[in-house]
Interface confidence: medium
Amino acid sequence: KLTIESTPFNVAEGKEVLLLVHNLPQHLFGYSWYKGERVDGNRQIIGYVIGTQQATPGPAYSGREIIYPNASLLIQNIIQNDTGFYTLHVIKSDLVNEEATGQFRVYPELPKPSISSNNSKPVEDKDAVAFTCEPETQDATYLWWVNNQSLPVSPRLQLSNGNRTLTLFNVTRNDTASYKCETQNPVSARRSDSVILNVLYGPDAPTISPLNTSYRSGENLNLSCHAASNPPAQYSWFVNGTFQQSTQELFIPNITVNNSGSYTCQAHNSDTGLNRTTVTTITVYAEPPKPFITSNNSNPVEDEDAVALTCEPEIQNTTYLWWVNNQSLPVSPRLQLSNDNRTLTLLSVTRNDVGPYECGIQNELSVDHSDPVILNVLYGPDDPTISPSYTYYRPGVNLSLSCHAASNPPAQYSWLIDGNIQQHTQELFISNITEKNSGLYTCQANNSASGHSRTTVKTITVSAELPKPSISSNNSKPVEDKDAVAFTCEPEAQNTTYLWWVNGQSLPVSPRLQLSNGNRTLTLFNVTRNDARAYVCGIQNSVSANRSDPVTLDVLYGPDTPIISPPDSSYLSGANLNLSCHSASNPSPQYSWRINGIPQQHTQVLFIAKITPNNNGTYACFVSNLATGRNNSIVKSITVSA
């Protein structure tokens, strides 16, 4: 069937449209196009004879039409009047006619719209605003956007006039936004520039900052006022009802008690004509004197002297406070406060009592702190430590020993070798040592203030050949599943590798085994009874290797759940009952028996001769290991038949 398709159907003014013919019959003589829904010679646009390929314009021809051999018609530079129906009249070679009608619609290209408003400065909670989208255009759809979003649902928003007008009732400050309108028709869509709604509001009740209402004499008073308002508010300050100044901030330097009173901030909006005020009451307190600490002993000796710290000046009806190390006073029998808290006494000072100490005087407003005071506690010297801790050195290296003893004032040091004084220094250095440098190295530390002296002696062996090592342990009887054991291979020697063996084998891989301290220390975590083995440590350097004697770990365990033997539970009357109880335990457990809950003897074996049915019942064996502190038990039922 012959059909006409309009491409496009909706055509913009000035563009073109193609009336495309489908299912054109064969053996044609020619065809004609007419404006309208029927064949009307007065409204012929163009005719076409196929044989001559000749096109003939008709009365309705505008000069903008082009006919194609396939009968399609192109109309260019479309105008509004072109809207409507078009009919194709086909004449076949057998002179039988056929007709088909098509149509299209013409729309204008829309101009960019703009928004007009009936109120450029609406007042919050009072005015309404009507936005209108211009120009008014036929066959156009109107849309609105707020902050580039489609209109929210609100009873205060209303569309009218075919959506061309948007009315906001009772505007609020939140309506301050970007508004746009959009016009659409089938051939175009255009969006307006945004219009910002300027809602007048406020002032709200002003806020005065800072919130602080208490000041001390001599401080600066700096108050700032702010009220939400559009346009921004104008501010005025009143003190005790008297106008001061028209500024947002009020500044009064070096205030006195006389500046106490009520401070009012007034905010005024000239556009809305509204005023709002806020009042704050300021209290100015007199400045108390800054406290300070006096001490009855500036250089106390540790474990000998007491020190009394007093907070000055003495002021009646005042609360005194103390701090040590920026913390409130700890509870300690060595710290005593006087009745009025003004004096803090430290009994038998220690080196940890250095402080700093602060005292404070409390007034209505705040606490005034003294400057911190630090005690110079004389102490020491403690037993000196000689480092490094190596006792074995290989020949040819440098021996560098350092001595340190905790002491105040710092200790003076002396070194002796085999009892002979060497030098009065903290460090002893001997280069390129030989076996002859083996001996007893003594460090002496002296505190000139306390007059005390302490010494430490270290045996140094110079030899490339390593000694036979030994194993020290931090726990000789660890408890299974509870304790850890640390084995240390002695001595500590320079440039030495430490190795370990368990039962003659190298260490197994286990998360419970950990080597540390340069492999010198072997730690067994959460020991088990299976760890009760022979442990050997080895040391090696470039020229020698040596192994310790084995150390067997004595793991305390158990008691495990006991076993009663024999397993029989049925006996004949007159038989002997001989029950033996055993529980795995180290050390061996203590055994006790209960028959039907009644305690019997404390033995591993329970013997009853010539039993009768009276001996029926429950037989319980209890085991306890005093070393592990653990207990266990088992119950067995015995039946004696007559």
Partner: antibody
Amino acid sequence: QVQLQQSGAELVKSGGSVKLSCTASGFNIKDSYMHWVRQGPEQGLEWIGWIDPENGDTEYAPKFQGKATFTTDTSSNTAYLQLSSLTSEDTAVYYCNEGTPHGPYYFDYWGQGTTVTVSS
Amino acid sequence: ENVLTQSPAIVSASPGEKVTITCSASSSVSAMHWFQQKPGTSPKLVIYSTSNLASGVPARFSGSGSGTSYSLTISRMEAEDAATYYCQQRDSYPLTFGAGTKLELK
């Protein structure tokens, strides 16, 4: 099993230098110290020194300071002894000797020796 | 350096005979080590740290001593024991060997 394979015999002119090698198998030389010992014709054993292949630390007998230089190549598990300013006195068999108790004892493992002959 | 003096320089022994070789140090040492060397072969450790038998060494070998005086003893000489024996100290650098004692089979 632990083995030390030394390079072949060397004939060197007086004043010249030579580099001997010792390749280990059965262990990683980084876990050991490598000692070098020499033995002159019809003479006793003389300790030259050692090298720690892990960090390159060395110890030389005073007599061989400046004469012997130890190096290692851990990628090929090989230790080297370089001898310089050779004289007829340096004619000897040179042994490498592994100084860590794989055995479990020290000095259990020796190379087969490299004969160095210094000719004038 | 610590000089080690071995004696005798040469010793002959019949199979089954007891042999003792001594080693004297110019400075005291904590331990002495002994090596055996047969012609054309590398030295082999026989005793370490004065008295410990090295791996694979027959029990007829033993060692003793302290300070500056040490000895190696073969309780019953066997033909395979014929070799040169060297003592070694490892207490001080340089490590030193004795001049050697040649043990021959009678």
